[in-house]
Interface confidence: medium
Amino acid sequence: DTHKSEVAHRFKDLGEEHFKGLVLVAFSQYLQQCPFEEHVKLVNEVTEFAKTCVADESAENCDKSLHTLFGDKLCTVATLRETYGEMADCCAKQEPERNECFLQHKDDNPNLPPLVRPEVDVMCTAFHDNEATFLKKYLYEVARRHPYFYAPELLFFAARYKAAFAECCQAADKAACLLPKLDELRDEGKASSAKQRLKCASLQKFGDRAFKAWAVARLSQKFPKAEFAEVSKLVTDLTKVHTECCHGDLLECADDRADLAKYMCENQDSISSKLKECCDKPLLEKSHCLAEVENDEMPADLPSLAADYVESKDVCKNYAEAKDVFLGMFLYEYARRHPDYSVMLLLRLAKAYEATLEKCCAAADPHECYAKVFDEFQPLVEEPQNLVKQNCELFEQLGEYKFQNALLVRYTKKVPQVSTPTLVEVSRNLGKVGAKCCKLPEAKRMPCAEDYLSVVLNRLCVLHEKTPVSEKVTKCCTESLVNRRPCFSALELDEAYVPKAFNAETFTFHADMCTLSEKEKQVKKQTALVELVKHKPKATKEQLKGVMDNFAAFVEKCCKADDKEACFAEEGPKFVAASQAALA
């Protein structure tokens, strides 16, 4: 399917609106520090050029690859060296090395100010004055903060953002209408970004075999009535889509995602009975709906797996004939029977099965050797079951904030070298698993919890890779994707860690604490908690609880005082002294 002009092909396939949106996202994800106006200018130039190629595919430069065209455009930015330092060296390279270079310089934790939400009237005025600019600004601000955000999905978020303003800016109570919608979009957006980051890490760090295995397991759970051949086709297409998006090929990615949605809707009968309502929707909504679709019902009469994968005398011959297909079918068969297992557990079982076959098919009596392979799965299954049970009990006992604190202490003791902001961010998100998953029925708890934890721990891995400080973190992050969570769960108190020297400044607070939102107050207190544990890693739960209770009381007292700052100045040193004594 070759085209004389790739840029013309994508412009025609996607249409001008989506083309411009995707180019803006691509540029914002590469050059995360550039001002909005600069990006808009570049996008307009690329769009005008694309139109000339649509008019005449043989026109000058229209035959160039998208990487060449986009890279050349990015390299025209005048302040590249001052703003990005060594990233400017990418421009001396030829494609495909230049694009690889840009990808390597994507920053998962860019030094950008947190987005401040203006007053509702201010936002509505901006929306009405220039809707197009308002929506472009949204794409730009999200994309630069989330350089791996799934681009076609970001267009869907922008469409919902637009719909929220169109509806709520007409409402009697604009704020009551708009703010919950914006909160929902923010939370869903962060979750979407983190999920996509795991997909990209899986592809980039562990290769497409790892991603395909993940996709086989997940799609087999979703579409248990589909045949293996059908699941394989979807996996192949989905892998292509995500490889493109993770590689910065956003136009190709969006185009192929649309093709995949079209294929799924044309072949519903052989995929799933749950696709019908998705397929009636417009493109962006349809693709989102298909990605989030609930699991179909399992066929009623699925036979036992043992006959084909354990009892059969041909197991080793079949495995030798086509290892990946045989393992793929095993994973498909296991996953479609177990919507109650996490994808990561299913992948561990497939790995264990593969290891058994590798060992046993070289043994004197292979059948005797692998006869008990399913028994070996039991501890692998019980480990996440027990983990979910224990942590949900703890969550129900403590509530979210205190559950987060328990995790903060647990993880700071495991990896105290990790920066405090990272420990706070990751532990707060780990703690959200309780509210998200523990209320679900038993059969949905493990897939919800463990697959969510994998996403959160990937964030830790991504941040740690940028500034590595802990060999333990590096080991858990790089050795095995599917065993990351069990690896972190198994970490104990780091005995080799030299406690951090006490710094009174870290525990000095001011009256500005009182004007913070509840969330910001929690973050401040949790930051202090991490610093306490870094100072006294062997402090008991009771000691830490005592200090934190005193801290809460001290803040509450001073925030009620007439002269708040004077109270903090006087009570602060007393709190610090009492805390040091309590932890001595």
Epitope: F228, A229, Y319, E321
Partner: nanobody, 125 residues
Framework: EVQLVESGGGLVQAGGSLRLSCTAS????????MGWFRQAPGKEREFVAA?????????DYADSVKGRFTISRDNAKNTVYLQMNGLKPEDTAVYVC?????????????????WGQGTQVTVSS
């Protein structure tokens, strides 16, 4: 959808040989058990031979063709073969290829989901 296309049928004298081929459109052909069935005019469809998925190490035959017919598969070519030797007039029928994703191998027609159009084999005496 798996499309199955048979070829190799024809008219042959008793005692002669034919080799039937069945090519599948699906890339995951290796994961299907394959079978040959036949239907003579005015008779029920009957099982002829089956071969297991993957390496195809397990085969099964109807008693009436054992020792004369051989089923095999070439996964690289997405093709299953039926080598028929010592043909008899009672082997005259339309031979139909079928694919099953239900089991690694099966001789039961209800476990096959995909069927070809068939190829005519006529054995004259």
């Amino acid at each position: 959808e798996v499309q199955l296309v048979e070829s190799g049928g024809g008219l042959v004298q008793a005692g002669g040989s034919l080799r039937l081929s069945c090519t599948a459109s699906r890339r995951a052909f290796i994961g299907y058990a394959m079978g040959w069935f036949r239907q003579a005019p005015g008779k029920e469809r009957e099982f002829v031979a089956a071969i297991s998925w993957f390496a195809g190490d397990t085969t099964d035959y109807a008693d009436s063709v054992k020792g004369r017919f051989t089923i095999s598969r070439d996964n690289a070519k997405n093709t299953v073969y039926l080598q028929m030797n010592g043909l008899k007039p009672e082997d005259t029928a339309v031979y139909v290829c079928a694919a099953s994703s239900a089991r690694p191998m099966s001789g039961r027609s209800d476990e096959y989901h995909y069927w070809g159009q068939g190829t005519q084999v006529t054995v004259s005496s």
